[in-house]
Interface confidence: low
């Protein structure tokens, strides 16, 4: 079966060694290696020069990693940064709240524990399905990435399902129906994988998808001008009609002698069966 | 493919330690891994996962006292204060889903002790 | 907090026998199917049995087979071999504020 990599996976940045992974180029990163390594760009003002990109490099800022606490916003001041509180927060870095439990601030039905004076914080304890200091953001229950072989996860609220790629089945897509391992082709035949299934090349007087029925040659006709067709062990002999030779009678004897028949490879008489 | 666990040895209690499991023939960076831990005698105890998208959970026991990190080949535990009660066989493993971790690491025993 | 129990302790079958080990869950598994199965021998680490309550793991054999949802799981062993003495233990996934595994307490297979 061809390799299929995680679905989502960056075809630009992102390669796989076996069915279901997403490994990153160099300079990218993220689970689907959507991610660019660093974000700085060249026209970044500070830092050191890289030697490998000739990039400048930001050097470590004031607002890197975000110091403002409860989703504040970090912006660089001449001396240091300053912290845009939401509503309901306040200090450096955002890190007081002035909210209680009475303003309700638990979202998605989560649950607030926490004093009833101004001074006092509080904690939300989320139901499932739910994060966050709020209980704000719905977790993504598809990043468990449940589904094998880049089968899409499908949230259905009461379930995660599978949508498999075509060649793959199972509740996590993890049997691989165009897999040979294990699929036995009968009387010789060998397993050959595409299309979505396995199927079988049969030996010669074999058929069927797993070469278990016994073909009749005979049955498509290849004697050509009225010869007769005699199965073989080896696979068929047919009996010109008279004027007709070759392995299939389709070459016309000639009154004269002489056939049409090309010129016979060393070692082979005009009219023997050619196998 | 295949998993190693470093760094277990014999410890005071309130010692921080760091464990590293090193991956071998693939990359750490696209699978979950996670940490377990089995006291002598004892059962298995999960203790915390990174998953592919670099998220880390634990379990509520180890939320402070366990941190896990990791690059393209190694995942670390580190410890912040170790008690006699850890004194345990730590294994780390790989999964490709959250119901499967077929791939383990032999496990690095550490020892708390004063 | 979840807790998982596995039954029984311990057990002992005959070799070509049959033993059978539940896992009850107190809330139910993600999924109703995040369960797996493991396999761990003395001073060895756990091998991948059974992952999503029933699909067989690479390499093992069919003779021990998953099933169960939600809270309720059981692993069976059929035509015992003397290889299959070992511990087996279940492990869950849940979703609560984030994502947690647990583990079962485990289960000894005794082969006579």
């Known amino acids: 079966a061809p390799l299929v990599c995680r679905a989502g996976c960056s075809p630009e940045h992102g390669f796989c060694e076996q069915p279901g992974e997403c490994r990153c180029l160099e300079g990218w990163t993220g689970p689907l290696c959507t991610v660019p390594v660093s974000t700085s760009s060249c026209l970044s003002p500070r830092g050191p020069s890289s030697a490998t990109t000739g990039c400048l490099v930001p050097g470590p800022g004031p607002c890197d990693g975000n110091p403002c606490a409860n989703g504040g916003s970090c912006s660089e001041t001449p001396r240091s940064f300053e912290c845009t509180c939401p509503r309901g927060f306040y200090g450096l870095r955002c890190e007081v709240s002035g909210v209680t439990c009475a303003d309700g601030p638990c979202f998605n039905g989560g649950l607030c524990v926490g004093g009833a004076d101004p001074d006092s914080a509080y904690i939300c304890h989320c139901p499932p399905g739910f994060q966050g200091s709020n209980c704000e953001k719905r977790v993504d229950r598809c990043s468990l990435q449940p589904c094998r072989n880049g089968g899409l996860c499908l949230d259905l609220g009461h379930a995660l399902r599978c949508r498999c790629r075509a060649g793959f089945a199972g509740p996590r897509c993890e049997h691989d129906l165009d897999d040979c391992a294990g699929r036995a082709c009968a009387n010789g035949g060998t397993c050959v994988e595409g299309g979505g299934a396995h199927r079988c090349s049969c030996a010669l007087g074999f058929g069927g998808r797993d070469c278990r029925e016994r073909a009749d040659p005979c049955a498509a006709r290849p004697c050509a001008h009225g010869g007769r067709c005699y199965a073989h062990f080896s696979g068929l002999v047919c009996a010109c009609a008279p004027g007709y030779m070759g392995a299939r009678c389709e070459f016309p004897v000639h009154p004269d002698g002489a056939s049409a028949l090309p010129a016979a490879p060393p070692g082979l008489r005009p009219g023997d069966p050619q196998r | 493919q295949s998993l190693e666990e470093s760094g277990g040895r014999l410890v005071t209690p309130g010692t921080p330690l760091t464990l590293t499991c090193t991956a071998s023939?693939?990359?750490?960076?696209?699978?979950?891994m996670i940490w377990v831990r089995q006291a002598p005698g004892k059962g298995l105890e999960w203790i915390g996962i990174?998953?592919?998208?670099?998220s880390t959970y634990y379990a509520s026991w180890a939320k402070g006292r366990f941190t896990i990190s990791r690059t393209s080949t190694t995942v670390d535990l580190k410890a912040t204060s170790l008690t006699t009660e850890d004194t345990a066989t730590y294994f780390c493993?790989?999964?490709?889903?959250?119901?499967?971790?077929?791939?383990w690491g032999p496990g690095t025993l550490v020892t708390v002790s004063s | 907090d979840v807790v998982m129990t596995q039954t029984p302790s311990s057990v002992s079958a005959a070799v070509g026998g049959t033993v059978t080990i539940n896992c009850q869950s107190s809330?139910?598994?993600?999924?109703?199917?995040?369960l797996a199965w493991y396999q761990q021998k003395p001073g060895q680490p756990p091998k991948l049995l059974i992952y999503?309550?029933?699909t067989l793991a690479s390499g093992v054999p069919s003779r021990f087979k998953g099933s169960g949802s939600g809270t309720q799981f059981t692993l069976t062993i059929s035509d015992l071999e003397c290889d299959d003495a070992a511990t087996y233990y279940c492990?869950?996934?849940?979703?609560?504020?984030?994502?947690?595994?647990?583990f079962g307490g485990g289960t000894e297979v005794v082969v006579k």
């Open positions: 999503a309550a029933s």
């Open positions: 990174v998953d592919s998208g670099g």
């Open positions: 023939g693939f990359s750490l960076n696209t699978y979950h």
């Open positions: 809330q139910s598994v993600y999924n109703s199917d995040f």
């Open positions: 492990q869950g996934t849940y979703e609560d504020v984030g994502w947690f595994n647990d």
């Open positions: 493993a790989r999964g490709g889903s959250w119901d499967g971790f077929n791939i």
